[in-house]
């Protein structure tokens, strides 16, 4: 996260951070608790890393530095990534995970809420981004779990800050015209959140941006509400029932 | 399957036209930034142009400045390029090509993805 | 403009033996945006390497890149008898994009 500060124990139970354990151990990107068993993250982050038993998922955890072998952390037992997605281009970057077991929620692990699906009437304008990511382009992951307040962008400004991408509907934007604050590397997966009517929605999975806090250059994440069929077909079909924390 | 046909090459005149085309299956066409590349005889790939998804936005290289259009109907799933006051030096297989633009570690990623199979343009008198 | 020169202009290897081809760019370039093609006469490029190091679809594991900054190889750990064309390397940092001059990796 560029341009944001520390977060607090229980601001954002719902961030997780998936790590890679091959030789050494790593933050990749983040994620968001979205039922007991599910985490829901961008479909990118597994590109040339497919394998479920390298990943280590660490839900209830603001500091990376505080975690030591013996920190639990939950392992995959599947890796649902959208039928749609191609490793050639931006859209459908959101894929489910299956936790091997449960979590138990606590007050520093649990989960966000999802919007109703096809949420185009919503305003919002609290809306934030959190994340380990770096904290400039050419950074490093951060130890302190960072927040930042950025406003959503209509998609027709966002295609003209990205004329040689295409933004489609499923894609919503957040910037600062200046830049200064954005998501960045090590963000990717996790969660652009808004708070509307006291209750804190899932509205976007952070995906893509050029570079990091530039002027004009907002950053992209993958619209929820648009994928709600595909949320709920996937964790239905794979629990019997539903265990989503939808909107009250 | 992916697939890029481009035709229209041939053989023209100095300061002749030509109009090639490069029809697209197997993607959604309209959601990609297609270029073009040539590769005159015995030599290596030079890039010519490309133009984003929409058509709106176009760039060239300095050698074809001004004398080359690069265009495209996403109705049509059709990439053309529209070369005028062509010169002996643009003698070249052209080729089409698929931009792939991947996410990696939250950038974009930028790469020719598909390639057409060519077309031979000939500039001679 | 960026530059990209490679080396050697050719390679003469045996099948089974390792090829390492450099591509120096004259200025930096985001490895996103560094790519590796193979041609082999008369056909189009074929995409090997894309983001500096990651495989294309299809491409076997002894294809290999790496690299930053200014500094990219493409390692083929293992010649194969097809493995035997011209090698690329291209950028799109920053327009105009360029390619390299050319590898040729010939039959020893």
């Known amino acids: 996260i560029v341009g944001g500060t520390n977060s607090s124990w229980g601001e954002w139970p719902w961030q997780v951070s998936l790590q890679v354990k091959l030789t050494a151990q790593r933050h990749l990107c983040g994620g968001s608790l979205i039922g007991h068993q599910w985490v829901l993250t961008a479909a990118h982050c597994f590109d040339g890393l497919p394998l479920q038993d390298v990943w280590r998922i660490y839900s209830g955890i603001l500091n990376l530095s505080d975690i030591t072998k013996d920190t639990p952390f939950s392992q995959i037992k599947e890796i649902i990534i959208h039928q749609n997605y191609k490793v050639s281009e931006g859209n459908h970057d959101i894929a489910l995970i299956k936790l091997q077991a449960p979590l138990n929620y606590t007050e520093f692990q649990k989960p966000i809420c999802l919007p109703s699906k096809g949420d185009t009437s919503t305003i919002y304008t609290n809306c934030w981004v959190t994340g380990w990511g770096f904290s400039k382009e050419k950074g490093e992951i951060q130890n302190i779990l960072q927040k930042v307040n950025i406003p959503l962008v209509t998609n027709e400004e966002c295609q003209k800050r990205y004329q040689d991408y295409k933004i489609t509907q499923r894609m919503v934007c957040a910037g600062y015209k200046e830049g200064g604050k954005d998501a960045c590397k090590g963000d990717s997966g996790g969660p652009l959140v808004c708070k509307h009517n006291g209750m804190w929605r899932l509205v976007g999975i952070t995906s893509w941006g050029e570079g990091c806090a530039r002027r004009e250059q907002p950053g992209v994440y993958t619209k929820v509400a648009e994928y709600m069929d595909w949320i709920l077909e996937k964790t239905q079909s794979s629990d019997g029932k539903a265990q989503m924390q939808s909107p009250a | 399957e992916v697939q890029l046909l481009e035709s229209g090459g041939g053989l023209v005149q100095p300061g002749g036209s030509l109009r090639l085309s490069c029809a697209a299956s197997g993607f959604t066409f309209s959601h990609y930034l297609m270029t073009w590349v040539r590769q005159a005889p015995g030599k290596g790939l030079e890039w010519v142009s490309y133009i984003s998804p929409s058509g709106g936005h176009t760039i060239y290289a300095d050698s074809v400045k001004g004398r080359f259009t690069i265009s495209r109907d996403n109705s049509k799933n059709t990439l053309y390029l529209q070369m005028n006051s062509l010169r002996a030096e643009d003698t070249a297989v052209y080729y089409c090509a698929m931009v792939g633009q991947g996410i990696r570690g939250r950038s974009r990623t930028s790469y020719f993805a598909q390639w057409g199979q060519g077309t031979l343009v000939t500039v001679s008198s | 403009e960026i530059v990209l020169t490679q080396s050697p202009g050719t390679l003469s290897l045996s099948p089974g033996e390792r090829a390492t081809l450099s591509c120096r760019t004259s200025?930096?370039?985001?490895?996103?945006?560094l790519a590796w093609y193979q041609q082999k006469p008369g056909q189009a490029p074929r995409l090997l390497i894309y983001?500096?190091?990651s495989r294309a679809t299809g491409i076997p594991d002894r294809f290999s890149g790496s690299g930053s900054g200014t500094d990219f190889t493409l390692t083929i750990s293992r010649l194969e008898p097809e493995d035997f064309a011209v090698y690329y390397c291209?950028?799109?940092?920053?327009?105009?994009?360029?390619f390299g001059q050319g590898t040729k990796v010939e039959i020893k």
């Open positions: 200025q930096f370039v985001n490895s996103n945006y």
């Open positions: 983001g500096a190091s």
């Open positions: 291209q950028q799109s940092s920053r327009t105009p994009w360029t």
